[in-house]
Interface confidence: low
């Protein structure tokens, strides 16, 4: 809040001339502006300048009792109406009022443009008491004024719930032109027209604009602010700025670079993050964008195989994030991968190509001719099969997985066995008698487990029955044979 230093001065006689502490600055005094207060003007005579009528913002005090006379209306005295000064100068202005001593309590506040000044300003109120009236001078000082100090200042006095408002004092800070809009950096298409805008204000006005391109003036005659420069087109990068001139001098805007859009540089550092049998996850570092945002990228994939036809697979993807999972690849295959990205101008060259490989896949076919029969003397089930015809991409066979499910009255139990790749037969112990055993076999490579063969069922009788007839599935068929012994 403003510190209101109530300096109790020595008794000070009322004086015929101006009050002490009156304005001392480089100012221009103008006629008073119209009153802005809600108070009705009333005819009054200033106690310090008898006989001079003044129509101001006044408060007419009430009659204190039936027999007392009407007290003279109160109003702030005239002061300077307009102060013009240069930036960074100091200024001090005041308002004064003489208040009959009947009024025991007053407060004075300063307001600017309708808002009370509560900040760290220098506001001092001085009191000069006499037998009948007290002269009050409220001073306001600003050191090193800035443009933001421009505005209309008033004093407000509260007295017995009445409010008295002074005439406004207009402060006008003049200085070098101040930019309200400066040219902005742009990325433009070659040989295409574009506009640059520059706007600066005073006071003092007018403000005139000169445009500068690469340190040379563009316009011989100045343009009044605001100014729009239309550039018909550029073939190479240029730097533009504007100069704003007024009576106080010249201000130069920031220099802005106008870039010419071009195709992007190729991406760099294409890297493999993860490979599976049928996909490769890659990332890349985008090249320079050519002053135009990347729109999308293209991942180009060539199979590195003398027998392949050399065709290129193209996968389009968004420009960000700089990653892509290439899918639908062959297992156990070598690929050459490159990345290109585009902006509105066109496509970049392709990045340096990198080599990548997919891992081996799982088998695509099941073992053939699965045969199951009961060896009751050993309480075993014998299983035989033929090795599947796997493709090279499925990788090397590492073994087989045998699923056998045992089902009897309301109970079902699945067990899994793993056997080596050299086997084409296996024996499993009978788990339950008087039950059905269902057998399925899948081939296994490092790439995973292939599909299971069609189920083959065999019935395991109670102890004492003898039968060695096998259950089997023929090589090409999808039958689901059941042999009950």
């Amino acid at each position: 809040a403003i510190t209101e230093a109530r300096e109790e001065a020595k008794p000070y006689p009322l004086f015929p001339g101006p009050l002490p502490g009156s304005l001392q600055t480089d100012h221009t005094s103008l006629l008073s502006l119209p009153h802005t207060s809600g108070y009705q003007p009333a005819l009054m005579f200033s106690p310090t300048q008898p006989g001079r009528p003044y129509t101001g913002n006044v408060a007419i005090p009430r009659v204190t009792s039936a027999g007392s006379k009407l007290l003279p209306p109160l109003a702030f005295k005239h002061t300077v109406g307009h102060i013009i000064l240069s930036e960074h100068k100091d200024v001090k202005f005041n308002c004064s009022i003489s208040v009959p001593n009947i009024y025991q309590d007053t407060t004075i506040s300063w307001w600017k443009d309708g808002k009370e000044l509560l900040g760290a300003h220098h506001a001092i109120t001085q009191f000069y008491p006499d037998d009948e009236v007290t002269a009050i001078i409220a001073s306001f000082s600003i050191t090193s004024v800035q443009r933001s100090d421009n505005g209309s200042y008033i004093c407000k006095m509260k007295i017995n719930n009445e409010e008295i408002v002074s005439d406004p004092i207009y402060i006008e800070v003049q200085g070098l032109p101040h930019f309200t809009k400066q040219p902005e950096s742009m990325n433009v298409t070659r040989n295409t027209a574009f506009n640059l805008t520059c706007q600066a204000v005073g006071p003092p006005e007018p403000v005139n604009i000169f445009w500068v391109q690469n340190s040379s003036r563009v316009n011989e005659q100045p343009e009044k602010s605001p100014s729009v420069l239309t550039v018909p087109g550029l073939t190479e990068m240029a730097v533009f700025s504007c100069e704003a001139h007024n009576d106080k001098g010249l201000t130069v805007s920031k220099g802005v670079q106008i870039n010419i859009k071009a195709i992007p540089s190729p991406p760099t550092e294409v890297s493999i993050h993860n490979s599976t049998a049928h996909s490769i996850l890659i990332s890349w570092v985008p090249g320079f964008d050519g002053y135009s945002p990347f729109r999308n990228c293209s991942v180009q994939v060539k199979e590195v195989d003398p027998l392949s036809n050399g065709s290129v697979m193209i996968f389009n993807t968004s420009a960000s994030p700089h990653m892509y999972q290439i899918k639908q690849l062959q297992a156990l295959a070598n690929y050459s991968i490159g990345v290109s990205c585009m902006n509105e101008i066109g496509w970049s060259a392709v990045s340096p190509w990198i080599l990548a490989s997919t891992t081996e896949g799982a088998p695509s076919v099941a073992p053939l001719n699965v045969t199951v029969f009961l060896n009751e003397s050993r309480d075993n089930v014998d299983i035989r099969w033929m090795k599947p015809l796997t493709k090279r991409q499925a990788g090397e066979l590492v073994g087989y997985r045998i699923s056998h499910v045992w089902q009897s009255a309301g109970i079902s139990k699945e067990l899994l066995e793993e056997v080596g790749q050299n086997n084409s037969r296996a024996q499993i112990s009978v788990q339950v008698h008087n039950a059905t055993c269902t057998v399925r076999i899948a081939a296994v490579t490092k790439g995973g487990v292939g599909p299971f063969s069609d189920p083959v069922k065999i019935f395991i009788p109670a102890h004492g029955w003898v039968d060695h007839a096998p259950s089997s599935t023929p090589a090409p068929g999808n039958a689901d044979p059941v042999l009950i012994i």
Epitope: T268, E269, V270, S271, I272, H273, S283, W284, V285, P321, H322, M323
Partner: antibody, heavy 120, light 107 residues
Framework: LIQLVQSGPELKKPGETVKISCKAS????????MNWVKQDPGKGLKWMGW????????TYADDFKGRFVFSMETSASAAFLQINNLKNEDTATYFC?????????????WGQGTTLTVSS | DIVMTQSPKFMSTSVGDRVSITCKAS??????VAWYKKKPGQSPKALIN???NRHTGVPDRFTGSGSGTDFTLTISNVQSEDLADYFC?????????FGGGTKLEIK
């Protein structure tokens, strides 16, 4: 199985030299750069720099220029951190950490850390 | 140097909860942020790289997100084995810099 196994804890006197090793296994050593990270007792992690395991070229963070030397031995698939003229403030746990991929600078596997105590 | 401000420093949670840890970079690091987990006496383990890429073998309960300057590691359905220190790393500019770490405690 990718592993970085660091040498055991060290107790040294100020002014001495220490050499910490980081032995890599389970991958091609020269395909991944090796970073070194310092963790002061009860504090956060500080990146010291890295060594290009293909060229042997080291890069040091500003705070680790001078007394710190990164080296390697390709045949042993090992990286080394040597600290000369030890000071008390070198007391810390030092980690080696493998660079994930060329294009990005993150680490994907770390050593278990080597605790260095410098005390007179 | 790029400063990575990680919060919170400590976090207490219960099994089954969802928690989020954030790292704020002092300048734009695109998506070059990695997250790590460190248990006492063990080496740090990679969780996330490039802001959102899960490292091999990391459960999908761990999710990374963010770009530019703000990054988050979210652990959904917290398990007892998640008790650890977590820290972020910006790997956009040298020198690489780490967040101060978050200690996750299980109630």
């Amino acid at each position: 199985l990718i592993q970085l196994v660091q040498s055991g804890p060290e107790l040294k006197k100020p002014g001495e030299t220490v050499k910490i090793s980081c032995k890599a296994s389970g991958y091609t050593f020269t395909n991944h750069g090796m970073n070194w990270v310092k963790q002061d007792p009860g504090k956060g992690l500080k990146w010291m720099g890295w060594i290009n395991t293909y060229t042997g070229e080291p890069t040091y963070a500003d705070d680790f220029k001078g007394r710190f030397v990164f080296s390697m031995e390709t045949s042993a698939s090992a990286a080394f951190l040597q600290i000369n003229n030890l000071k008390n403030e070198d007391t810390a746990t030092y980690f080696c950490a493998r660079k994930g991929v060329t294009a990005a600078r993150y680490f994907d596997y770390w050593g278990q850390g080597t605790t260095l105590t410098v005390s007179s | 140097d790029i400063v990575m401000t990680q919060s919170p420093k400590f976090m207490s949670t219960s099994v089954g909860d969802r928690v989020s840890i954030t790292c704020k970079a002092s300048q734009n690091v695109r998506t070059a942020v990695a997250w790590y987990k460190k248990k006492p006496g063990q080496s740090p383990k990679a969780l996330i790289n490039l802001a959102s890429n899960r490292h091999t073998g990391v459960p999908d309960r761990f999710t990374g997100s963010g770009s530019g300057t703000d990054f988050t590691l979210t652990i959904s359905n917290v398990q007892s084995e998640d008790l650890a220190d977590y820290f972020c790393l910006q790997h956009w500019n040298y020198p690489l810099t780490f967040g101060g770490g978050t200690k996750l405690e299980i109630k």
